[in-house]
Amino acid sequence: YDFTNCDFQKIEADYLRTISKDLITYMSGTKSTDFNNTVSCSNRPHCLTEIQSLTFNPTPRCASLAKEMFARKTKATLALWCPGYSETQINATQAMKKARKSKVTTNKCLEQVSQLLGLWRRFIRTLLKKQ
């Protein structure tokens, strides 16, 4: 999906209002220095591309974040403010359905969410630079 035509201001507002709080809740008990951020993003479409991929693509060490509240809200926000996004997300929906029922938060998932927070913060910063 090409995120170029999203309403970035509306996505920023949704992030600041709800998604950020859910991410921070998920990370509660860990310090921002606990994990080394190894990925970043260049501009707003790039940030959203990587956020979407990291949120919804299962990785070997963290099977799925897609069932988490912040992921559901991210999906809803992108569907709302990115034209045509929801039609491209059949695979992501299937991944959410296949997600493990157990609510165990592994250290690797915490690390992945720490990376996500970094990408979201970069998204906000690139938005501020453009204004």
Partner: antibody, heavy 117, light 108 residues
Framework: QVQLQESGPGLVKPSETLSLTCTVS?????????WSWIRQPPGKGLEWIGY???????SYNPSLKSRVTISRDTSKNQFSLKLSSVTAADTAVYYC??????????WGQGTLVTVSS | EIVMTQSPATLSLSPGERATLSCRAS??????LAWYQQKPGQAPRLLIY???SRATGIPARFSGSGSGTDFTLTISSLEPEDFAVYYC??????????FGQGTKVEIK
């Protein structure tokens, strides 16, 4: 200390597909970062080809996108480049590199690929 | 595509002298700029990222400055091992990251 090593044929015929592999040691490619390919024609500057991130997102240089495929094999800690329909203009030293998806902090030593019949 | 133009193409200096290399972007890249050093037969090495942050293990004699379209790499006092080609790279314009054509710093 992460180390990267490119391997593959040094000679490819025009119209064929160039295939290279980068073997990474000292760091798991599924643990973090992105894993990129960059090339440098003899005596010329650098050109970014694309990357695959540790979580599987892939990004390509638009000028090469129609011909490029980057993939990975996490069990071997390797990632690969395929460039189809090559011409003499694709003759270059090809580097693999670790990236934070912005810039490139560790590089392989490079491998020269010549396109010639 | 953002075009990166480096000047001069060649800089002839003696060890101990100060080197000032310029990189200009065809449009603003904010501070999304990196500098690399490449010696003959070797891979490039990251020196500077985010326009002014030194990469791990890079000596303090290397410094970067600038923002927007004009950037400078300064080597305060050239050591013999600093004679090489230097490239700038912008990473503001994903997915079209571009490099400058390089500046060669040679011994006078």
């Amino acid at each position: 200390q992460v180390q990267l090593q490119e391997s593959g044929p040094g000679l490819v015929k025009p119209s064929e597909t160039l295939s290279l592999t980068c073997t990474v040691s000292g760091y798991s490619i599924s643990s973090g970062y992105g894993w990129s390919w960059i090339r440098q024609p003899p005596g010329k500057g650098l050109e970014w080809i694309g990357y695959i991130s540790y979580y599987g997102s892939i990004s390509y240089n638009p000028s090469l996108k129609s011909r490029v495929t980057i993939s990975r094999d996490t069990s071997k800690n390797q990632f690969s480049l395929k460039l189809s329909s090559v011409t003499a203009a694709d003759t270059a030293v090809y580097y693999c590199a670790r990236t934070n998806l912005l810039y490139f902090d560790s590089w392989g030593q490079g491998t020269l690929v010549t396109v010639s019949s | 595509e953002i075009v990166m133009t480096q000047s001069p193409a060649t800089l002839s200096l003696s060890p101990g002298e100060r080197a000032t290399l310029s990189c200009r972007a065809s449009q603003s890249v904010s501070n999304n700029l990196a500098w690399y050093q490449q010696k003959p037969g070797q891979a490039p090495r990251l020196l500077i990222y985010d326009a002014s942050s030194r990469a791990t293990g890079i000596p303090a004699r290397f410094s970067g400055s600038g923002s927007g379209t004009d950037f400078t790499l300064t080597i305060s006092s050239l050591e013999p091992e600093d004679f090489a080609v230097y490239y700038c790279q912008q990473y503001s314009d994903w997915p079209q990251y571009t490099f400058g054509q390089g500046t060669k710093v040679e011994i006078k």
